[in-house]
C-alpha cells in the first residue's frame, strides 16, 4: 500500500530555502534531499524542485499547505507549499506549521497559553483560496489546552488532522473545525472537481481511509455531472 513510507524508492520533499514565503518565487515548490535508488545503496544528493499538485490542504503533508505558488500565477494550479513558521503571515490555520495556528493573520504558537489552561482563538475561514481577504466568517472559540497533549476524539475542536485521534480527521463543521471519522468503504465522499470548491463546504467530510479512493458509484455513471454520487471504494 501507499503506507509503506520507508519504501526504498520513495523521495521526500523538503521545504524551500529559509525565508521563502508563499506567493514569492523560490517558495513555489519543495527541494528533494536525495534518492535511494532501488536495488542499490547509493544515496545521491539532488537539489531540484518537486511540485506536488493539490486541491486542498489534506492532500499535502502535515508540514505543508495547498496554495497557488505565485500571487499572479496560474490561478488554476495549486501545489503543496512548506508551512509557515511562527510570526509569519497566514490566512488560515493549515498555513502554519504544527504547533502553531493562524491568529489575526500571523502564525502564533498553540502552546503560548498552556499555563493558563485554555487558549482563545479566532477561527477565520475565508471561503476561497489564498487570494481572498481575511474578513471571512469569524467567531470566538475556546479550545482546551488538553487538545494539544491528547489527540481529540470525535467532535473535539481541532486545527488540523494531527490534532485528532487515529481514524479521525479535522474537517469543517459550520465555521469551526472538528474531528470527524475518516470514511469507510461504501460511505459517500466528496470529489472536488472544481478548484476551490472545497472552500464552500460548511459540513466537510473526511477523506477515504487507507486502501480506498473516492470514485463514482458504478450505477451512477450515467447520471449527470451534478448528481453523480461518489463513494469510498477499494483500489
Amino acid at each position: 500500500t501507499l503506507n509503506s513510507v520507508l519504501n526504498s524508492n520513495a523521495i521526500k520533499n523538503l521545504p524551500p530555502p529559509l525565508g521563502g514565503a508563499a506567493g514569492h518565487p523560490g517558495s513555489a515548490v519543495s527541494a528533494a534531499p536525495g534518492i535511494l535508488y532501488p536495488g542499490g545503496n547509493k544515496y545521491q544528493t539532488i537539489d531540484n524542485y518537486q511540485p506536488y499538485p493539490c486541491a486542498e490542504d489534506e492532500e499535502c503533508g502535515t508540514d505543508e499547505y495547498c496554495a497557488s505558488p505565485t500571487r499572479g500565477g496560474d490561478a488554476g494550479v495549486q501545489i503543496c507549499l512548506a508551512c509557515r513558521k511562527r510570526r509569519k503571515r497566514c490566512m488560515r490555520h493549515a498555513m502554519c506549521c504544527p504547533g502553531n495556528y493562524c491568529k489575526n493573520g500571523i502564525c502564533v504558537s498553540s502552546d503560548q497559553n498552556h499555563f493558563r489552561g485554555e487558549i482563545e482563538e479566532t477561527i477565520t475561514e475565508s471561503f476561497g483560496n489564498d487570494h481572498s481577504t481575511l474578513d471571512g466568517y469569524s467567531r470566538r472559540t475556546t479550545l482546551s489546552s488538553k487538545m494539544y497533549h491528547t489527540k481529540g476524539q470525535e467532535g473535539s475542536v481541532c486545527l488540523r488532522s494531527s490534532d485528532c485521534a487515529s481514524g479521525l480527521c479535522c474537517a469543517r463543521h459550520f465555521w469551526s473545525k472538528i474531528c470527524k471519522p475518516v470514511l469507510k468503504e461504501g460511505q459517500v465522499c466528496t470529489k472536488h472537481r472544481r478548484k476551490g470548491s472545497h472552500g464552500l463546504e460548511i459540513f466537510q467530510r473526511c477523506y477515504c481511509g487507507e486502501g480506498l479512493s473516492c470514485r463514482i458509484q458504478k450505477d451512477h455513471h450515467q447520471a449527470s455531472n451534478s448528481s453523480r454520487l461518489h463513494t469510498c471504494q477499494r483500489h
Partner: nanobody, 122 residues
Framework: EVQLVESGGGLVQPGGSLRLSCAAS????????MGWFRQAPGKEREFVAA??????YYADSVKGRFTISADNSKNTAYLQMNSLKPEDTAVYYC?????????????????WGQGTLVTVSS
C-alpha cells in the same frame, strides 16, 4: 506498495515526438498526483511535469512542448513530448504521489518507477 512501469522510450530525431506511458498499481490514482521526472547522463534528476484532478504543473523547460495526462480507468499516466531537443535526452521516471497527511506524512512525496530511456539525436 506502489508499482510503476514506464514504456514508450526510444530514439527520436530532434523536432520529433514521443509518448511515454506509466502503468500504476496500488496507487489511489484519481486522488493523488502522478508525475514525470528525468535524469540526463551525469546530471541530477529533475522535475518535468505532474498532474492530479486539480490540475497539471510543468517545468519551465518543457512548457508548451510536453503535455501530461492521466486515464483513471486504465490507471495510466502519459507524457506526450513534442518538438524534442537533444537536451531532452534522459532516463524518464514515472512518479506516484503518496497522499500526504492522509497517510501521516509530514511532506507529500513521490514514489518512483525504474525509468525509460529517451534519446534525441540525429
Amino acid at each position: 506498495e506502489v508499482q510503476l512501469v514506464e514504456s514508450g522510450g526510444g530514439l527520436v530525431q530532434p523536432g520529433g515526438s514521443l509518448r511515454l506511458s506509466c502503468a500504476a498499481s496500488g496507487h489511489t490514482f484519481n486522488t493523488y498526483p502522478m508525475g514525470w521526472f528525468r535524469q540526463a547522463p551525469g546530471k541530477e534528476r529533475e522535475f518535468v511535469a505532474a498532474v492530479s484532478y486539480s490540475g497539471s504543473y510543468y517545468a519551465d523547460s518543457v512548457k508548451g512542448r510536453f503535455t501530461i495526462s492521466a486515464d483513471n480507468s486504465k490507471n495510466t499516466a502519459y507524457l506526450q513530448m513534442n518538438s524534442l531537443k537533444p537536451e531532452d535526452t534522459a532516463v524518464y521516471y514515472c512518479a506516484a504521489g503518496n497522499g500526504g497527511r492522509a497517510y501521516g506524512y509530514s511532506r507529500a512525496r513521490y514514489e518512483w518507477g525504474q525509468g525509460t530511456l529517451v534519446t534525441v539525436s540525429s
